[in-house]
């Protein structure tokens, strides 16, 4: 069980020792469902900068390099935890907050809704 | 600037009011780079359960439903913040920790390095 209010050390421990977090940095361009990354900044939040993925196309890129609208580019979303200053501008009091971020895009077969 | 140790209220505020976090729940199956979700549980971490995506195939699914090895399924990874009990089993003392999670998979044109 977790108590309501806890002490948190902000000196981050990075467990990504065996992996290269930059590894997927070029996928946004090489994917069949490419995306752009948009900077979302909020000084009241920790981390203050979060990058949001936005799919470039409604369809997916085919072998000829053209957009194929028989397929759909869709964002892969994940709920992440951030710290929000509470009350606002507070130097050392925060509240956990859950936000939904788009991490990248994937190409899916569309769900066809038949229009009568 | 952020101090080293702060007070955090664990009563989570969910800002995902206008979205349905389950919306992308079937993409793992409909994607041309489908993935399986594996449960990663750690009682010393908050959140204690994290879902890891593992791409099903080395290649991507083509229009015929077959795996095309001229394309690659790759994991989209994201660094996220979690709380780690410190010292271990501590009821109300935590440290911020950065971990790398695979959120889903996307289909990319390969960088040919070592495949003959």
């Amino acid at each position: 069980n977790f108590p309501r209010t806890v002490m948190v050390n902000l000196n981050i421990h990075n467990r990504n020792t065996n992996t290269n977090p930059k590894r997927s940095s070029d996928y946004y361009d090489r994917s069949t469902s490419p995306w752009n990354l948009h900077r979302n900044e909020d000084p009241e939040r920790y981390p203050s900068v979060i990058w949001e993925a936005k799919c470039r196309h409604l369809g997916c890129i085919n072998a000829d390099g053209n957009v194929d609208y028989h397929m759909n580019s869709v964002p892969i979303q994940q709920e992440i935890l951030v710290l929000r200053r509470e009350p606002p501008h507070s130097p050392n009091s925060f509240r956990l907050e859950k936000i939904l971020v788009s991490v990248g895009c994937t190409c899916v077969t569309p769900i066809v809704h038949h229009v009568a | 600037n952020f101090p080293r140790t702060v007070m955090v209220n664990l009563n989570i505020h969910n800002r995902n009011t206008n979205t349905n976090p389950k919306r992308s729940s079937d993409y793992y199956d409909r994607s041309t780079s489908p993935w399986n979700l594996h449960r990663n549980e750690d009682p010393e971490r908050y959140p204690s359960v994290i879902w890891e995506a593992k791409c099903r195939h080395l290649g991507c699914i083509n229009a015929d439903g077959n795996v095309d090895y001229h394309m690659n399924s790759v994991p989209i990874q994201q660094e996220i913040l979690v709380l780690r009990r410190e010292p271990p089993h501590s009821p109300n003392s935590f440290r911020l920790e950065k971990i790398l999670v695979s959120v889903g998979c996307t289909c990319v044109t390969p960088i040919v390095h070592h495949v003959a």
């Epitope: - | 399986n36 890891e52 593992k54 791409c55 195939h57 690659n72 994991p75 070592h114």
Partner: nanobody, 123 residues
Framework: QVQLVESGGGLVQAGGSLRLSCAAS????????MGWFRQAPGKEREFVAA????????KYADSVKGRFTMSRDNAKKQVYLEMNSLKPEDTAVYYC????????????????WGQGTQVTVSS
């Protein structure tokens, strides 16, 4: 830290067969494929074969297609390379490794390699 132990190499005559094994421990949650690689004297390490842990789907280098077969045992976290119709040009040290990005994993991203197992094919 990923630990890799390769075994099963040896000296064999051209046309013969060998079965290599690789035991992997400490794989990360993001691991979804394993690969076999080889390095002949004076040459760069090259890709031989890969297998998906989940689907069992495989990919082979053109030079070994139809002769080599890769398989895996998820429970034991082991992968195997069945090598038939061996040729002198297959002589090399054979290594296995985790492929966290599948076929897209680059050689320069490997922080760790096992000792490998020597395969020598005599004519």
């Amino acid at each position: 830290q990923v630990q890799l132990v390769e075994s099963g190499g040896g000296l064999v005559q051209a046309g013969g067969s060998l079965r290599l094994s690789c035991a992997a421990s400490g794989l990360t949650a993001s691991s979804y494929a394993m690969g076999w690689f080889r390095q002949a004297p004076g040459k760069e390490r090259e890709f031989v074969a890969a297998i998906s842990w989940i689907s069992g789907g495989t990919k082979y280098a053109d030079s070994v297609k139809g002769r080599f077969t890769m398989s895996r045992d998820n429970a034991k976290k082991q992968v195997y390379l069945e090598m038939n119709s061996l040729k002198p040009e297959d002589t090399a040290v054979y290594y296995c490794n985790d492929m966290p990005y599948g076929l897209d994993t680059r050689m320069d991203e490997y922080a760790y390699w096992g000792q490998g197992t020597q395969v020598t094919v005599s004519s």
